[in-house]
Interface confidence: low
């Protein structure tokens, strides 16, 4: 039987009355062409909604916008457009919301063509009040908050100036000209690239990378011949042009650019690219594009220094620079990532890793599904997940995969079951164990969201017709109940719930259309009365993550430790609550060779866990640059996988080789380094 139609499905009693009492409609007194919504702070209940309307005229764009504010999670909204003097707000800059619970908001206004600079509206009290500030420049980008201090803002101007404010946008100072890209680092450090001659485009590959640690009082050039740079975890990456040709290589620094090492990754040519897929303080996933217009490349995973890389996955789908990749971090279970590969026959297949890129496999076929037309063998096939690439190809996929750190083990995604991704209409699948096993959850495409840390899943059918029904499940998608939230169907445009999946409120956005009027409307449904009581100890059960063989003493060991979680029982209908903290009990595992990666100059032969010396490097000086100096590299061929916590067990000690190497990179040779003061 289809999910939700089992006789065993535990129904929530009287849910219609309970939800009806907690359904709040808000009709917006306008229909501007677009609506954008932002949550201000965490657990504050404050939402800002900006509606905008563009009228392109021959000489200029005339626009109108309205600003609304809710402080009860979207149940009621107040028009606060007068707080911003009825000014037109530029949607391309969005609403710049400050980090954490700073309560800060910056709105960038549209100004007339002849003005000296732009205009912003600033709030530091969760949008209760706004201050208008005229800027001495026209912003090119949204204001960027320092992650450490929300009073510090930076912005690029249309003239390529780098502007900084130390008092939350009240006063601005241009700290550098000819800037291409700027980013906040840690400790209020700013990294930026500059051009010397023509422009950012003309100087690509000849840019300089600069750093200021004191908001523009003094500067240090930390890189030359730069093509681009990026930050990930504790790593600073720069792609640097080679001396001899038009290729470039990745260099990495873990000390904010004071010292650099050449990453042991292939160099790339003009038409290729590097991309940091994911990074944390332990390691980085790096995609290196293949030569030619292939649409794929190779994923490499780094060691703890960001220097030595292991090949993780071949033929990784990534269309073009800044293009589409399906690479997804499954945040509900440690070590799990999902992505797509382009197979030899040009079909697209989904792969999953449970050990941070160590091994990749196909997704197990859901037990309640049959293989589709893409499958050669009707009994053997896999689940393939639709993500960014499918969405970009305009397949009938309304949402990317969803997982939340506090909804342990839950992954929801559109997919198809066969030998490859199908262009047919997808269904929605759910995993409750971080991607090891899957079940069909809903027929056809849906919008979905997780509430109350997984206690409730809400879904709305993706349809071109007006809708008035929402589906919800209190047992991780096994059984579904439907609730008609309005008599008059609406054209649905989106589901909105507070980021973090702790809320019990969901807002359904859409518009009504009749012969005379059309209006934006939102329905906010509070599920608090569905989950009547707070969860107690008896509502939780112990679950061992990554468990595949309970008989095995090392069952559940991933990256050197296993974790037992307290998980809400599917049969329990209760509130985890806003204060819910994931309870987990880690235990350390014994080391095996799987807990080590092969150090530079070593590799693992197929189906062997030992690291052996690379034949082509035997007796060679290694082209390996560490901190820009020639030095000896001592290694026993193994290096602990970043983040691996194993102890005891196998200790792969062998004769320590002294690998002499020369440093061929003159990147940032000492004479190129200079310090300047403003």
């Amino acid at each position: 039987s289809a999910p939700g139609e089992d006789e065993e499905c535990g129904r929530v009693r009287d849910f219609v009355a309970k939800l009806a009492n907690n359904t709040h409609q808000h009709v917006f007194d306008d229909l501007r062409a677009s609506v954008s919504l932002s949550w201000v702070g965490d657990s504050t209940g404050v939402i800002l909604v900006l509606t905008t309307f563009h009228v392109p005229l021959v000489i200029m764009t005339f626009g109108q916008s309205k600003l609304y504010r809710s402080e009860d999670y979207g149940k009621n909204f107040k028009d606060i457009t007068d707080l911003i003097n009825n000014t037109f707000i530029r949607t391309e800059f969005g609403m710049a919301i400050g980090p954490e619970n700073s309560g800060k908001v910056v709105l960038t206004a549209e100004v007339s063509g002849g003005s000296r600079g732009g205009r912003i509206f600033r709030s530091s009290d969760f949008a209760k009040n706004f201050v208008q500030t005229d800027l001495p420049f026209h912003p090119l980008t949204q204001m960027m908050y320092s992650p450490q201090n929300s009073d510090y803002l930076l912005a690029l101007s249309t003239e390529n100036g780098l502007w900084v404010s130390k008092n939350f946008g009240g006063k601005w100072e241009e700290i550098h000209k000819a800037v291409c890209l700027a980013k906040w680092g840690s400790d209020n450090t700013i990294f930026f690239t500059t051009y010397a001659n023509g422009s950012c485009k003309a100087d690509l590959g000849a840019l300089e990378l600069w750093r200021t640690s004191d908001l523009g009082k003094s500067f240090k050039t930390i890189g030359v011949k730069i093509y681009s740079f990026g930050l990930g975890g504790r790593f600073l990456f720069a792609s640097v042009m080679a001396d001899k040709d038009t290729t470039r290589r990745i260099h990495v620094s873990t000390d904010q650019g004071d010292t650099w090492s050449m990453a042991q990754l292939p160099s790339v040519g003009q038409e290729q690219f590097y991309s940091i897929l994911a990074a944390n303080d332990d390691m980085v996933f790096m995609h290196v594009d293949e030569p030619g217009d292939t649409g794929f490349g190779t994923i490499f995973t780094s060691d703890d220094r960001g220097i030595v890389y292991s090949k993780s996955l071949d033929r990784h789908l990534y269309t073009t620079t800044g293009g589409e990749t399906d690479f997804t971090n499954v945040t509900s279970l440690r070590g799990v990532y999902i992505t797509s590969v382009l197979s030899e026959d040009n079909s697209i297949q989904t792969m999953i890793t449970f050990d941070q890129g160590g091994r990749w496999t196909h997704l197990r076929k859901p037990e309640n599904s049959e293989c589709d037309a893409t499958a050669k063998n009707k009994n053997e096939c896999s689940l393939h997940i639709h993500a960014s690439y499918s969405i970009s190809q305009k397949l009938n996929v309304p949402m990317a995969p969803l997982s939340e750190p506090n909804a342990v083990g839950i992954v929801i995604a559109h997919g198809s079951v066969g030998d490859a991704i199908s262009v047919m209409v997808p269904d929605v699948y759910i995993s409750d164990d971080g991607g090891y096993s899957w079940t069909k959850m809903l027929e056809g495409p849906h919008y979905y969201t997780i509430l109350d840390s997984g206690g409730i899943i809400v879904a709305i059918e993706h349809s071109s017709r007006p809708i008035n029904v929402i589906k919800f499940s209190t047992d991780e998608g096994q059984c579904w109940q439907t609730y008609t939230f309005t008599r008059d169907p609406i054209y649905f445009t989106g589901l909105a719930s507070e980021p973090g999946a702790r809320s019990m409120n969901i807002s359904i956005w859409g518009f009504t259309e009749s012969f005379l009027t059309s209006q934006w409307v939102s329905y906010t449904i509070d599920f608090k009365d569905i989950l009547e009581r707070n969860c107690e100890e008896k509502d939780y059960t112990i679950w061992l993550a990554h468990s595949t063989d309970p008989e095995d003493y090392e069952d559940g060991c991933i990256l050197g430790y296993k974790e037992q979680f307290l998980r809400l029982r599917k049969s329990s209908v209760c509130q985890n609550g806003r204060d819910y903290v994931v309870t987990k009990q880690p235990s350390i595992c014994l080391c095996s060779l799987e807990d080590f990666l092969c150090d530079f100059g070593y590799y693992r032969p197929e189906n062997d866990s030992k690291c052996v010396e690379q034949p082509e490097l035997k007796g060679h000086d290694l082209e390996f640059c560490l901190y820009g100096r020639e030095e000896h590299l001592t290694t026993n061929g193994y290096r602990k996988i970043p983040g691996d916590k194993c102890q005891g067990g196998v200790n792969p000690v062998r004769e320590v080789k002294d690998l002499k190497k020369k440093c061929t990179s003159n990147f940032l040779s000492p004479e190129k380094q200079n310090s300047k003061s403003n």
Partner: antibody, heavy 129, light 107 residues
Framework: QVQLVQSGAEVKKPGASVKVSCKAS????????MSWVRQAPGQGLEWMGI????????SYAQKFQGRVTMTRDTSTSTVYMELSSLRSEDTAVYYC??????????????????????WGQGTTVTVSS | EIVMTQSPATLSVSPGERATLSCRAS??????LAWYQQKPGQAPRLLIY???TRATGIPARFSGSGSGTEFTLTISSLQSEDFAVYYC?????????FGGGTKVEIK
């Protein structure tokens, strides 16, 4: 090591104001909130309020609202607590305490409380005519 | 505001014995509760946070339990240095509030 060093003892007349400082060292100043707690002679602990060194947002106990002002100077990693319109019952030892979670000015606390893990040595304020 | 009530006000215990201190909240504070120890002339010292987690450097004889409105601090075998005043403090909703304290004295 992590330390909070407070300013010295003060003797004030009723109606006056007092400003106590608390200098933090050994950790990133902006990474933790700071609470102020006082203790009258022979009495228990009383929480006065909290300041977020990032941005300077504050939340005060209702009892002190309008009389207390908490500020910070990130350049010197120092927080200040000023209490005005002093009365004899304000005679107490005033402590600053590092508060790893803290509340935003907007309301409810964070989801997991780590406790005030580092305390200053205390500043004795005596209010007497 | 949430009112924290500690009992007993004074507890007389012999060295080596077990001491059990109670703290009750006027409404649920989940596990957002801390325990502190204060000796005469000294600043308070954090013992327990999150209702049951020992702070760094606190001996294993100190343990905390409870959730919601009822909390307990247990000192399994009192040492001479443990005679002091103990306070509980909630951080579920502002303003933070302390209990009135329990004085543990030598019997």
């Amino acid at each position: 090591q992590v330390q909070l060093v407070q300013s010295g003892a003060e003797v004030k007349k009723p109606g006056a104001s007092v400003k106590v400082s608390c200098k933090a060292s050994g950790y990133t100043f902006t990474s933790r909130y700071m609470s102020w707690v006082r203790q009258a002679p022979g009495q228990g602990l009383e929480w006065m309020g909290i300041i977020n060194p990032v941005g300077g947002s504050t939340s005060y106990a209702q009892k002190f609202q309008g009389r207390v002002t908490m500020t910070r100077d990130t350049s010197t990693s120092t927080v200040y607590m000023e209490l005005s319109s002093l009365r004899s019952e304000d005679t107490a030892v005033y402590y600053c305490a590092r508060d790893p979670s803290g509340i935003a000015a907007a309301g409810p606390a964070s989801r997991y409380y780590y406790g005030m893990d580092v305390w200053g040595q205390g500043t004795t304020v005596t209010v007497s005519s | 505001e949430i009112v924290m009530t500690q009992s007993p006000a004074t507890l007389s215990v012999s060295p080596g014995e077990r001491a059990t201190l109670s703290c009750r909240a006027s409404q649920s504070v989940s596990s957002n509760l801390a325990w502190y120890q204060q000796k005469p002339g000294q600043a308070p010292r954090l013992l327990i946070y999150g209702a049951s987690t020992r702070a760094t450097g606190i001996p294993a004889r100190f343990s905390g339990s409870g959730s919601g409105t009822e909390f307990t601090l247990t000192i399994s075998s009192l040492q001479s240095e443990d005679f002091a005043v103990y306070y509980c403090q909630q951080a579920r909703l502002g303003p933070w509030t302390f209990g009135g304290g329990t004085k543990v004295e030598i019997k």
